[in-house]
């Protein structure tokens, strides 16, 4: 079909029309100069045609190759632990919006980065296998143009709070380290919660092609919809969460709270926020200090834990974090035992008293008194998000809400033992914390953000979009790298997929029209015979 | 007022290394960051690496990366920068300096007097 | 690395005249950017530091300004003493870069 109309679009259907017509009043002669004229004509039209294309064509692609590829590198130092993420894009492409992706993902054995403050001559050490993954993944030839940046995220942000000295060691003992490798090592800083916020924003909505202004012939970008309506995004970290999205309405509700960019030629107002100390860790943490504030004894028992599960817990391990000062109170006791019961319902419970819901200054809030304008169009859930719900196998677009907290349930009051034998290879420190932040992130994004059993189908956890990861990296290389430009760049008229078929097409035309110029032409007049 | 003192002066044979000391003295060292900054006849100032003595951890610039050394001894104050595979373009005033802070507040404070180093065949 | 940039190379001036020094960076520092004084035979002395707050013992004739990538060390009314070479530095990434230095000579 496809290639009846391109034959019909080059004049070769009429070529075929005259050669099949019926000619028996025709004398031989007369046939000849005929079809000798005609097909000359054609022959010509189609030729001048098929090399007008292929030069415009050429000319106005002009595509440099061999392509001269470009490396990045940046750590993500969480609060509990650091990954370190390389990408690589087409140099002559660095401002199309969708070229960067990931090539490797390296994750650095070890905690985060804010625990080693009483051990910072180990940092070193730390980060030398991840260091060294990049310098055999990166070519040499590469190293000393391949940005090398590092974004401390919460686990900084409250060690800094405790103490800035101490952060500030820290962080000038990764800068001594990384600085030591063959790269353009372009500093360790703490990003600002804002920040997390709009560069997993601006990630997620330029692995989907939402930056994009070009149509395309197909997509290949999963959860893609129609319009180039942007997704909003949620992040789940140890220490803290973000929400930013583009709501219906500009609101100046709360300054705080907005964001304006000019991408690629279009200007969004986003809405951000990040909660410090609502991570799944530091959560579970405020959720554990409040709770043994009314404990009868050194005995908590916990609807959050699985059934027979036990756990001796340090109280000044308990305080270490500013995340728990709130619930601070003297203790008759050193240590408590968590004792799991493994009831969804209580826990879901306990999980919405860490959200302060009783007061809001604004329109519309989220928790402790935030600003939420009303939730608009798709939303990305990524990092825990995505991890924990994975674990659960509660990821498909196709289960409901309603289903989510069904298996929740079940899930959650399966004994211990069991849970273990089911999952032997499952690190137990990880296992045993499912439950609780299953149900803290239903908690989260039912109460905490407003998302309901039907917005609950726009919620997409997402791992990775087109083998690279969803989470703030991305977005925060490409801004250091100035390859977000502000404004729609000049680019080449064609994807480079569709040029290389048109060039082929038309290739293909003018060896068919030479093809079939010989055989007319170059042939005895046994040939016309046949064709009378 | 802390004050660098640096070992005198040193002639070298090509490819040999040389073992240059800085002793704080009036004070400690402390956390503070001690640099190596070498200054070539009628040249400018180039960085060649540092080192946090009370955690042993330093850094070094690409160029002088796999052929300096620089350690520290906390319990004499002292901090050493070894230099190997010496050439003729490595003659030059060899200073240590003191960093008055930690993250990205490595301005040079304190100087020592300077320490230098010929290499000749 | 960053790339320090230091102009003119040789400034003349007459004593009691203004002095001013330039500074560029190849990228931004912020103001993480540190002068120094050095005269024939010593080391260096630093002047300023975060572009414009003076080192203990300095004079205020001795004046930095800037941010990011353009800085300036101005020297009010040059004295004898103040002929001397003038280095600045970045200490906001390593490997910590300095410029090439301004000459001050005596015109």
């Known amino acids: 079909m496809l290639f009846d109309s391109i034959l019909s679009t080059v004049g070769l259907s009429k070529l075929v029309s005259v050669v099949s017509s019926p000619a028996a009043a025709l004398s031989k002669s007369n046939v000849k100069t005929f079809c000798s004229k005609n097909i000359l004509a054609i022959l010509g039209f189609s030729s001048i045609i098929a090399v007008i294309a292929l030069l415009a064509v050429g000319l106005t692609q002009n595509k440099a190759l061999p392509e001269n590829i470009k490396y990045g590198i940046v750590l993500d130092a969480g609060s509990s632990h650091t990954s370190l993420y390389i990408y690589k894009w087409p140099a002559e492409k660095e401002n199309d919006t969708g070229v960067v992706h990931q090539v490797e993902e390296c994750r650095v054995k070890g905690p985060g980065i804010s625990k080693y403050v009483q051990k910072v001559n180990e940092i070193g050490i730390y980060l030398t296998d991840c260091m060294e993954r990049a310098r055999e993944v990166i070519p040499r030839s590469q190293h000393q143009e391949t940005p090398v940046y590092l974004g401390a995220t919460a686990g900084m942000r409250l060690l800094r709070m405790e103490s800035e000295e101490l952060a500030d060691r820290v962080l000038d003992v990764v800068e001594r380290s990384l600085s030591n490798y063959p790269f353009d090592f372009q500093g360790a800083r703490i990003i600002t919660g804002q920040e997390e916020g709009a560069y997993g924003w601006i990630t997620i909505n330029y692995l989907l092609g939402k930056f994009s202004q070009k149509t395309r012939w197909f997509s290949i970008v999963p959860y893609e919809t129609n319009n180039q309506e942007t997704f909003g995004a949620l992040d789940l970290g140890g220490a803290s969460t973000q929400i930013t999205f583009v709501p219906q309405n500009q609101t100046t509700e709360s300054p705080d709270n907005a964001l304006q960019f000019r991408l690629y030629g279009k200007d969004y107002n986003v809405y951000t926020h990040s909660f410090l100390c609502y991570g799944k860790d530091q959560a579970l943490w405020q959720k554990l200090a409040k709770d043994i504030q009314v404990a009868s004894n050194e005995i908590l028992r916990d609807p959050c834990f699985h059934p027979g599960y036990k756990k001796v817990v340090n109280v000044s391990d308990l305080y270490k974090t500013p995340c728990t000062k709130r619930f601070e109170m003297t203790l008759p006791f050193q240590q408590f035992e968590i004792q799991g019961i493994g009831n969804y319902q209580q826990c879901h419970q306990s999980v919405l008293e860490l959200f302060n819901t009783s007061y809001c200054p604004y329109s519309q809030c989220a928790f402790n008194g935030i600003f939420l304008p009303p939730l608009q169009g798709d939303f990305g859930a990524f990092s825990a998000f995505y991890f924990v719900m994975n674990f659960l196998n509660l990821t498909s677009e196709k289960v409901s809400q309603e289903k989510v907290t069904e298996m929740m349930k079940k899930f959650c009051s399966q004994p211990w033992e069991e849970i273990k034998t089911s999952y032997a290879g499952v690190k137990e420190k990880y296992l045993s914390e499912y439950c609780f932040s299953g149900t803290y992130i239903l908690s989260l994004l039912l109460q905490g953000y407003h998302f309901t059993a039907d917005s609950w189908e726009h919620i997409h956890f997402i791992g990775k979009i087109q083998g690279s990861d969803a989470g703030w990296t991305l977005g925060y290389m490409l801004n250091l790298t100035n390859m977000i430009p502000a404004e729609q760049p000049l680019s080449t008229p064609l994807s480079h997929s569709t040029y290389v078929f048109l060039m082929v097409l038309f290739s293909l035309v003018l060896v068919i029209v030479a093809i079939i110029g010989l055989l007319i032409f170059h042939k005895p007049s046994y040939f016309w015979k046949d064709m009378v | 007022q802390v004050q660098l003192v640096q070992s005198g002066a040193e002639v070298k044979k090509p490819g040999s290394s040389v073992k240059v000391s800085c002793k704080a003295s009036?004070?400690?060292?402390?956390?503070?960051?001690i640099s190596w900054v070498r200054q070539a006849p009628g040249q400018g100032l180039e960085w060649m690496g540092s080192?946090?003595?009370?955690?042993?951890?330093?850094n070094y610039a690409q160029k002088f990366q796999g052929r300096v050394t620089i350690t520290a001894d906390e319990s004499t104050s002292t901090a050493y920068m070894e230099l190997s595979s010496l050439r003729s373009e490595d003659t030059a005033v060899y200073y240590c300096?003191?960093?008055?802070?930690?993250?990205?507040?490595?301005?040079?404070?304190?100087w020592g007097q300077g320490t230098m180093v010929t290499v000749s065949s | 690395e960053i790339v320090m940039t230091q102009s003119p190379a040789t400034l003349s001036v007459s004593p009691g005249e203004r002095a001013t020094l330039s500074c560029r960076a190849s990228q931004s520092v912020g103001s993480n950017l540190a002068w120094y004084q050095q005269k024939p035979g010593q080391a260096p002395r630093l002047l300023i530091y975060?572009?414009?707050t003076r080192a203990t013992g300095i004079p205020a004739r001795f004046s930095g300004s800037g941010s990011g990538t353009e800085f300036t060390l101005t020297i009010s009314s040059l004295q004898s003493e103040d002929f001397a070479v003038y280095y600045c530095q970045q200490y906001l990434l390593w490997p910590l870069t300095f410029g090439g230095g301004t000459k001050v000579e005596i015109k």
């Open positions: 009036g004070g400690t060292f402390g956390s503070y960051g």
């Open positions: 300096a003191r960093e008055s802070g930690t993250y990205r507040d490595h301005r040079l404070d304190v």
């Open positions: 080192i946090i003595p009370e955690f042993g951890i330093a």
């Open positions: 975060g572009a414009s």
